[in-house]
Interface confidence: medium
Amino acid sequence: IIPVEEENPDFWNRQAAEALGAAKKLQPAQTAAKNLIIFLGDGMGVSTVTAARILKGQKKDKLGPETFLAMDRFPYVALSKTYSVDKHVPDSGATATAYLCGVKGNFQTIGLSAAARFNQCNTTRGNEVISVMNRAKKAGKSVGVVTTTRVQHASPAGAYAHTVNRNWYSDADVPASARQEGCQDIATQLISNMDIDVILGGGRKYMFPMGTPDPEYPDDYSQGGTRLDGKNLVQEWLAKHQGARYVWNRTELLQASLDPSVTHLMGLFEPGDMKYEIHRDSTLDPSLMEMTEAALLLLSRNPRGFFLFVEGGRIDHGHHESRAYRALTETIMFDDAIERAGQLTSEEDTLSLVTADHSHVFSFGGYPLRGSSIFGLAPGKARDRKAYTVLLYGNGPGYVLKDGARPDVTESESGSPEYRQQSAVPLDGETHAGEDVAVFARGPQAHLVHGVQEQTFIAHVMAFAACLEPYTACDLAPRAGTTD
Amino acid sequence: IIPVEEENPDFWNRQAAEALGAAKKLQPAQTAAKNLIIFLGDGMGVSTVTAARILKGQKKDKLGPETFLAMDRFPYVALSKTYSVDKHVPDSGATATAYLCGVKGNFQTIGLSAAARFNQCNTTRGNEVISVMNRAKKAGKSVGVVTTTRVQHASPAGAYAHTVNRNWYSDADVPASARQEGCQDIATQLISNMDIDVILGGGRKYMFPMGTPDPEYPDDYSQGGTRLDGKNLVQEWLAKHQGARYVWNRTELLQASLDPSVTHLMGLFEPGDMKYEIHRDSTLDPSLMEMTEAALLLLSRNPRGFFLFVEGGRIDHGHHESRAYRALTETIMFDDAIERAGQLTSEEDTLSLVTADHSHVFSFGGYPLRGSSIFGLAPGKARDRKAYTVLLYGNGPGYVLKDGARPDVTESESGSPEYRQQSAVPLDGETHAGEDVAVFARGPQAHLVHGVQEQTFIAHVMAFAACLEPYTACDLAPRAGTTD
């Protein structure tokens, strides 16, 4: 498909001249950021961004790649080096420590320097590193965590927890020996390490005692409370704040977000991770966009500003399953949340960053025609005389041999939301990838986001932009009209 | 491997604070660029950049990812959308038209708008678009093309040629009907379309009549001249300029580059593409770094400045073979050329851009330990109880079934320069990938390189920075001390 207007050189020359004009107008703001938002696309490497752009464009009846994601509109871009101290290819725990605390850690640890060792409880104490969210709170800002995973998951936990094992969601997941040594589960740390104003995502079951039925799935014992210590962490959290509200469904969330008496809001919408966007029951569970909007409504009441972490956490899960349909539809919802946040905030006073913790071994090749489905087949056949998809994985569960050979695939099969793209190597779960990821930035001090940087730089830019520790002597003018 | 110094949070905090300090000091230059250099890593997607960084670091006895490529030091980064008008995943012809001429074209066409159709000679005339190199020449600058492929290959051809078929290297490749319609081969266009001061790379055989023995392989008929028109294009080119010199080996190149009487230099060091760096005979063939240095020595004599195109063109070829060793060692030599150019030029007056035309379906995953070989195995086994490499391809010739199963691999096999990494789909040649690629920028007007842009933006930034057509009214101050 060749769009007629694109055949004319004037189309491209005019478009580029406009882009140049916009680039020339870019003026680095010399003011401090009142608000900080970090949007984290878990597993959202550059190949995921491009494929999602095409899909989002095609959902709007465009050819695809010429369209813009919300994140594409951010004026500044850098590349972020994601390796952990001990691994070339990292996990979401070590990376969360990097972009939220400004220090690199070891694989599967969270909120700890690399002096801590995975699963060794006695290496925790003294190696804690403090997140930018925690520092924002100490500076009088309101703070929030929003995710499509469980709120105790590796990425959001980087904002508040310190643990040698990212899998210690509730005390039932922590070995007795580690509990005796004083190592706390992540759910406990969620409510006790610091005061978080807004907590939205999944993860109900880690907050309640074993045997507590889940409100949404009361007959499903496996979805009920998991805690061995008998604690009801939601109750404990509610008791801490007079204006605290706990909600577990969309209707309650929308009500609470508009209620001026609510100062603290915890919404846990699934026992574990939230459902994929394509499986979400829109009457019961809010979308990531809706959770983001609710968080911003509450947090923006604080005249001193806020810090908000928003995670599209299941992009990663779709990729691990080698189900690109899930990964890409999650990415689009993540981008929709970015777009909505942009409408609800001002780039005059809000530094917004979009990045990924790491990438995936996910590729988009095969020379497909413009406008063809991102989930479709490449033109021509492979060397085994069978069709193949444009989307493929280096490794993962999509590897199948049928009668000792690679299976053929049709356009209708490859377009199914359940289809697993093929891979070179058979694994139960497709792996992360180690290449640099993009950082998109907009707002005060966004111009500092440049070049190729360590992932830790992200936390430092946020801290500096808002004059938080260790950059309280940041020498930035407060935005005109800022209240304190 | 955990470096002791990296266990200390101070290491990361100090490093990030320094990076912030450098970011704060960045001052967009308001001057015009006297010189333009575009470094094109053919097929150098972000996954290739990261893997090459690690390899280059490890060759210097470092762990790898913490080190810097020369391109990593460039202060500004953007993402470039590489699709062609007719394909989601492009080729090197359409992309060359974009980043060198500022207009997107169709797959496998060069220097033509998308109104031209692949292989249809009669759609050429009237659809030609003019490269920035051509515009630089018209403005009185010296211009050069340096590549490790044949100089008539798609990427360099974007700087001087207009053709509906990128494969028309010599007239022997052009169908008789197209020749009769007046369509010229690329080699002819190389010497006749415009005056190029420096031409360095491979591609001897396309310049000489059929039956002309090659100077390096005189007994190998298949490497001799291919032309049917009986023309000796080198002779024709030499006759155009009093100070013109033709060389075909490294010794002659080094002599010519230091000879003040040489005003124009053509060096063709192989009949076709140049050898891979790991196979290069260092007495006969120059490296990309040496060719770049030679070009800069000649071009920088012009007080009005220069335009130089430098291509690491065989990164792409290594990937097409699914031989990551070749792709990554080519990337390192490309980066070495960037480094050398940086030493020979000043960022006060030279805008340098580094980018790729497109990516490849190449991934780096599997959670390898820090410091482990980039060509090594992932920890653990795959679901078929066999080892697997951290580097893999989505598709390509590395797909093999042995006794109806995926072959096992050892560390010594995977470390071999000949090893083909496995792929999900068997193809004769691994394909390009469609995700955005990075653009790195340094020098006057480099700050305009920002955000997510169409690939065409690159040509426009260069033209604007040097006040070339259509931006002659660029309103930029000439650099202090610039002579005319």
Epitope: - | E277, R280, D281, T283, P417, E418
Partner: antibody, heavy 123, light 106 residues
Framework: EVQLVESGGGLVQPGRSLRLSCTAS????????MSWVRQAPGKGLEWLAL??????????EYTASVKGRFTISRDNSKSILYLQMNSLKTEDTAVYYC??????????????WGQGTLVTVSS | DTQMTQSPSSLSASVGDRVTITCKAS??????IAWFQYKTGKAPKLFIH???TLQPGVPSRFSGSGSGRDYTLTISSLQPEDIATYYC????????FGQGTKLEIK
């Protein structure tokens, strides 16, 4: 002109060792992959070992039948290729050739060969 | 490791005959096959590389073809000086020779 001259062959008893040499000239020795190939009496050609060039760190590869017994090495200052053969067996009796790869053709085909040196393993 | 199966092991033909020798690889070798001529007491001589490219000085009656796993050496019109043993060599993955084909004149 590329020249390869093997030496060091002769009669040796089973279980003993022998070192073959191949002196190279006419090309930049460090830039090329070098191999040893043999031909046993009445048998076909058998590739034995490879040592890569400077750019690839002079890494080595062997065929299964000689792995652990034979070692390929090179003295780049003298442009000499070696094959150290230990624990020799009667079936190692053959003419041993050294060969240089050519990269021009995008592969590593054995383009240049020496004349060979005869090794006889017998008690 | 890649195995090469060469056939026939010996071949008797008359001067002027068209002669075909085949090599089958155990896996796809991506056209990385060479053919050598070997005469007793001499070093093997490279005749064809990359499936079909003739070495300098090799008569044009020799040709090579094939792809994937199957490859062929053809002599279009056998000459007395062509009497020798011919070996194929895969060089896609290290090196493996075929068993050889001994060519004789009837």
């Amino acid at each position: 002109e590329v020249q390869l001259v093997e030496s060091g062959g002769g009669l040796v008893q089973p279980g003993r060792s022998l070192r073959l040499s191949c002196t190279a000239s006419g090309f930049t020795f460090t830039d090329y992959y070098m191999s040893w190939v043999r031909q046993a009496p009445g048998k076909g050609l058998e590739w034995l070992a490879l040592i890569r060039n400077k750019a690839t760190g002079y890494t080595t590869e062997y065929t299964a039948s000689v792995k652990g017994r034979f070692t390929i090495s090179r003295d780049n200052s003298k442009s000499i290729l070696y094959l150290q053969m230990n624990s020799l067996k009667t079936e190692d009796t053959a003419v041993y050739y050294c060969a240089r790869a050519s990269f021009y053709y995008d592969g590593k085909v054995l383009a240049y060969w020496g004349q060979g040196t005869l090794v006889t393993v017998s008690s | 490791d890649t195995q090469m199966t060469q056939s026939p092991s010996s071949l008797s033909a008359s001067v002027g005959d068209r002669v075909t020798i085949t090599c089958k690889a155990s896996q796809d070798i991506n056209k990385y096959i060479a053919w050598f001529q070997y005469k007793t007491g001499k070093a093997p001589k490279l005749f064809i590389h990359y499936t079909s490219t003739l070495q300098p000085g090799v008569p044009s009656r020799f040709s090579g073809s094939g792809s994937g796993r199957d490859y062929t050496l053809t002599i279009s019109s056998l000459q007395p000086e062509d009497i020798a043993t011919y070996y194929c060599l895969q060089y896609d993955n290290l090196y493996t020779f075929g068993q050889g084909t001994k060519l004789e004149i009837k």
